[in-house]
C-alpha cells in the first residue's frame, strides 16, 4: 500500500495536509485546477548517493524505470517495492512498463515498439495482445501468453485528455502523465507554465496527478523571483536554457 | 472483446455488508485504473470510487467514504467493493468501469438496502 | 464540486433531425476533461465522446462532441431510431467525478 512506501522512506518529508489522512488515499475532498496542481510529494531530501527509491507505481520511478518487489515472488521486507532498472530488448516481462523506452511486453518478452500498430490507451489493447485471442490460455512460462500480431492496425495517437498507458501513446506535445486513478494524455508545458521538480528524476511520489513535463528548450527552474521563498514553496516554471 | 462482469448484489438490511465482485477479461488488467459508477433507481449515475491500476491508489466520494473499500485481485483480473453500514440511500444499481471516463462498463449489480 | 447541469431536461426530435445537447460546468475545466455518455432503458451507459471531441471506439461518426471551458455540445447530426436514450456529461478534471443530470431525447 501507499502507506508502507511512506513507512519505509526517508525520501519525503512535509507532506501536506491532504494526502496525511484517509491513509494515504487521496478522496473527493481533493478538488484542484491545473494552475493550482497539487504537489504532494515533490519535497525530497537530496539523495547523496544512489539509493533504491520506494515507489508504489511504475509512473512514479524514472521512464527507464518500473516499479517492483526487488525479487520476484518475495515481497520484500513489508512488501515493499522499488524502482528498478527497465528491461531491455528480449528480456521477460509482465507488463509494458517493465520495457525500457523504445519496447512494450509481448509474449512475456520486451520488443522493439512498431508505433503504427502501438496501441494508444483508449485503442483496445487487442492491437497487440491480438484480436480473438484466448486470455484464459496460461502460458508455460507463468506469463501472460499474448498471440502474434498477423497485421498491422493504424490508429491516431491520443489527444488531450485520453486515456494512455505510457507517452508514445500520446499526440505530440502532449505526454502520458497520472491523473487519479489513471493516466491520460495531457500538453506538454509550454514557457512560463508552472512545472513539478523532482529532486530525482522520475520521483512523482505522491502526486495525485502529474503535470507533463517542460518542452523542448526548456527547463523546469525556480522562477526567478521565488529565490527567496522557503523551500517548501518554490514555484518552478519552464524556462529558456 | 472487453468484458466485465459485477455480482455480489443483492437484498440486505441497513447497516448490514456486500462485497461486489468485477470480473474483467480481454485486456491487460493491471494496465487500467477501475471505477465504480451506482445508479439509484430512476435517477442519473453517481461516481462511487475508483483505483489505480496497481491498487496502490484509491479514491472515494464523500457519501461512501469510509463505509466502502475499492480492491483488486490483478492475479485473478477482478475488482471488488466491500460495502459495510449500508444506508437506503445506497439502494441503486452498481456499475464496475474501466478508466476514469468509463470506456467499458459491466451491465450492473442491483443493491437494495431495505428492512 | 463542479457541478454539471444538462440542457434540456427532455428533447423531442423525429428521426434525421439534428439533435443538440448542451452540458455547463459550474467551474471552468480548464482542459477537455469532459465525456458522454448513452444509456438506454435497462442498459449499463455507453462511452459516445471522451477528451471533449474525440469519438470512442465504435461509436458512429453522427455523433461530435465540441466545447470547452464551461460549455460543451454534444452533436448527434441526424438522428437514427436507436439514438432516442438518454445522454449524460461527465467531467474528469476534478474530483469527484461528477455527471450532469441528464437530457431524455425522445422520438416526437
Known amino acids: 500500500t501507499l502507506n508502507s512506501v511512506l513507512i519505509n522512506s526517508n525520501a519525503i518529508k512535509n507532506l501536506p495536509p491532504p494526502l496525511g489522512g484517509a491513509g494515504g488515499q487521496p478522496g473527493s475532498a481533493v478538488s484542484v485546477a491545473p494552475g493550482v496542481l497539487y504537489e504532494g510529494g515533490n519535497k525530497y531530501q537530496t539523495l547523496d548517493n544512489y539509493q533504491p527509491y520506494p515507489c508504489a507505481e511504475d509512473e512514479e520511478c524514472g521512464s527507464d524505470e518500473y516499479c517492483s518487489s526487488p525479487s520476484r515472488g518475495a515481497a520484500g521486507v513489508g512488501g515493499v517495492q522499488i524502482c528498478l532498472a527497465c528491461r531491455k530488448r528480449r528480456k521477460r516481462c509482465m507488463r509494458h512498463a517493465m520495457c525500457c523506452p523504445g519496447n512494450y511486453c509481448k509474449n512475456g518478452i520486451c520488443m522493439p515498439s512498431d508505433h503504427s500498430h502501438f496501441p494508444r490507451g483508449e485503442i483496445e489493447e487487442s492491437i497487440i495482445e491480438n484480436l480473438g485471442n484466448d486470455h484464459n490460455a496460461a502460458a508455460g512460462d507463468g506469463y501472460p501468453r499474448r498471440t502474434t500480431l498477423t497485421s498491422k492496425i493504424y490508429h491516431t495517437k491520443g489527444q488531450e485528455g485520453s486515456v494512455c498507458l505510457r507517452s508514445s501513446d500520446c499526440a505530440a506535445g502532449l505526454c502520458c502523465a497520472r491523473h487519479f486513478w489513471s493516466k491520460i494524455c495531457k500538453p506538454v508545458l509550454k514557457e512560463g507554465q508552472v512545472c513539478t521538480k523532482h529532486k530525482r528524476k522520475g520521483s512523482h511520489g505522491l502526486e495525485i496527478f502529474q503535470r507533463c513535463y517542460c518542452g523542448e528548450g526548456l527547463a523546469c527552474r525556480i522562477q526567478k523571483d521565488h529565490h527567496q521563498a522557503s523551500n517548501s514553496s518554490r514555484l518552478h516554471t519552464c524556462q529558456r536554457h | 472483446q472487453v468484458q466485465l462482469v459485477e455480482s455480489g448484489g443483492g437484498l440486505v438490511q441497513p447497516g448490514g455488508s456486500l462485497r461486489l465482485s468485477c470480473a474483467a477479461s480481454g485486456f491487460t488488467f493491471n494496465n487500467y485504473g477501475m471505477t465504480w459508477v451506482r445508479q439509484a433507481p430512476g435517477k442519473g449515475l453517481e461516481w462511487v470510487s475508483g483505483i489505480s491500476g496497481s491498487g496502490s491508489y484509491t479514491y472515494y466520494a464523500d457519501s461512501v467514504k469510509g463505509r466502502f473499500t475499492i480492491s483488486r485481485d490483478n492475479s485473478k483480473n477482478t475488482l471488488y467493493l466491500q460495502m459495510n453500514s449500508l444506508r437506503a440511500e445506497d439502494t441503486a444499481v452498481y456499475y464496475c468501469?474501466?478508466?476514469?471516463?468509463?470506456?467499458?462498463w459491466g451491465q450492473g449489480t442491483l443493491v437494495t438496502v431495505s428492512s | 464540486d463542479i457541478v454539471l447541469t444538462q440542457s434540456p431536461a427532455t428533447l423531442s426530435l423525429s428521426p434525421g433531425e439534428r439533435a443538440t445537447l448542451s452540458c455547463r460546468a459550474s467551474q471552468n475545466l480548464f482542459s477537455p476533461y469532459l465525456a458522454w455518455y448513452q444509456q438506454k432503458p435497462g442498459q449499463a451507459p455507453r462511452l459516445l465522446i471522451y477528451?471533449?471531441?474525440n469519438r470512442a471506439t465504435g461509436v458512429p461518426a453522427r455523433f461530435s462532441g465540441s466545447g470547452s471551458g464551461t460549455d460543451f455540445t454534444l452533436t448527434i447530426s441526424s438522428l437514427e431510431p436507436e439514438d432516442f436514450a438518454v445522454y449524460y456529461c461527465q467531467q474528469y478534471m476534478t474530483l469527484p467525478l461528477t455527471f450532469g443530470q441528464g437530457t431524455k431525447v425522445e422520438i416526437n
Open positions: 468501469a474501466r478508466t476514469i471516463y468509463m470506456d467499458y
Open positions: 477528451g471533449a471531441s
